[in-house]
């Protein structure tokens, strides 16, 4: 299910130098022929193209990954960068362009023979219920969802949340992923501030349920940044 935990980041409130005038969410942008959408006939406007700030790969387009624009750059400023083509260096699957994955530090073709059941770590979902394909690309998952005929119950191994029964999400548990309950009002939740924080979670929490968002608990506002407790609260 869709995460209704919403970071209310307005586009214009970006760290410099990324948030220029074109970053205003309401700004008028003229349509110009651009990049053809996968599975659609819409064209993305690319005049005045500005890099998109991100915290994780899934915030970027299908042909992008999230990273610092300079080697050894400030980890706090990351943008969506163009994916790496075949035979280019990589550190993780999402860096490689659709149809490829990262093997031994090099992007290689993701032809089915290569996979032999490898599971890519970054899984994304669509708004629709049919999750077997992602924009027609196999970049985000390397196991066919056809393997999952029944919806997983709590504790079942999963690839993505659509593999889990209603009210459950697919979250990391040690070094695999299992179906866990979606968080209810008042339950502690995780608010990710930096990309690196995802990788540290060996016990990942689900997101907050419908109508709830992950916010600082009111009586914790005065606490230090490191000890702030976030809970699922009504919008």
């Amino acid at each position: 299910t869709l995460n209704s935990v919403l970071n209310s980041n307005a586009i214009k409130n970006l760290p410099p130098p990324l948030g220029g005038a074109a970053g205003h969410p309401g700004s008028a942008v003229s349509a110009a022929p651009g990049i053809l959408y996968p599975g659609g006939n819409k064209y993305q406007t690319i005049d005045n193209y500005q890099p998109y700030p991100c915290a994780e790969d899934e915030e970027c387009g299908t042909d992008e990954y999230c990273a610092s624009p300079t080697r050894g750059g400030d980890a706090g400023v990351q943008i969506c960068l163009a994916c790496r083509k075949r035979r280019k260096r990589c550190m993780r699957h999402a860096m490689c362009c659709p149809g490829n994955y990262c093997k031994n530090g090099i992007c290689v073709s993701s032809d089915q023979n290569h996979f032999r059941g490898e599971i890519e770590e970054t899984i994304t979902e669509s708004f629709g219920n049919d999750h077997s394909t992602l924009d027609g690309y196999s970049r985000r998952t390397t196991l066919s969802s056809k393997m999952y005929h029944t919806k997983g119950q709590e504790g079942s191994v999963c690839l993505r949340s659509s593999d889990c029964a209603s009210g459950l999400c697919c979250a990391r548990h040690f070094w695999s992923k299992i179906c866990k309950p979606v968080l209810k009002e008042g339950q502690v939740c995780t608010k990710h501030r930096r990309k690196g924080s995802h990788g540290l979670e060996i016990f990942q929490r689900c997101y907050c349920g419908e109508g709830l968002s992950c916010r600082i608990q009111k009586d914790h506002h005065q606490a230090s940044n490191s000890s702030r407790l976030h809970t699922c609260q009504r919008h």
Epitope: A22, Q44, N48, E56, G61, E64, F127, G128
Partner: nanobody
Framework: EVQLVESGGGLVQPGGSLRLSCAAS????????MGWFRQAPGKEREFVAA????????HYADSVKGRFTISADNSKNTAYLQMNSLKPEDTAVYYC?????????????????????WGQGTLVTVSS
């Protein structure tokens, strides 16, 4: 093709609240962005809010920030726009919009109307 049907519009007094819903059907598996735009009489269609495919970002026009909240429920293929503290200038036809995940994304992506497919719209009138 994606079909989008809005509901929840109506007449409300200034300071009041409304919750718009947008039900998506058809080819919903490719949807990655759900948004709301609005068009007041005699004006151009303007961006209101959007929720990204990554589920971690919501984007709002300055004029509605702090008053409107966009959310979505994947299990129902539905997007919502909770509108609080409504003002007369919020009067407009509100359109639900949906788009697939692009190959490349830029800061202007979410507010660019040409990227989206559209519903028929629902009228919101704020008047005393």
């Amino acid at each position: 093709e994606v079909q989008l049907v809005e509901s929840g519009g109506g007449l409300v007094q200034p300071g009041g609240s409304l919750r718009l819903s947008c039900a998506a059907s058809g080819s919903t598996s490719s949807l990655r962005t759900m948004g709301w735009f609005r068009q007041a009489p005699g004006k151009e269609r303007e961006f209101v809010a959007a929720i990204s495919w990554s589920l971690s970002r919501t984007h709002y026009a300055d004029s509605v920030k702090g008053r409107f909240t966009i959310s979505a429920d994947n299990s129902k293929n539905t997007a919502y726009l909770q509108m609080n503290s409504l003002k007369p200038e919020d009067t407009a036809v509100y359109y639900c919009a949906a788009a697939p995940r692009p190959k490349r994304v830029s800061v202007s992506y979410f507010s660019t109307a040409s990227n989206y497919d559209w519903g028929q719209g629902t009228l919101v009138t704020v008047s005393s």
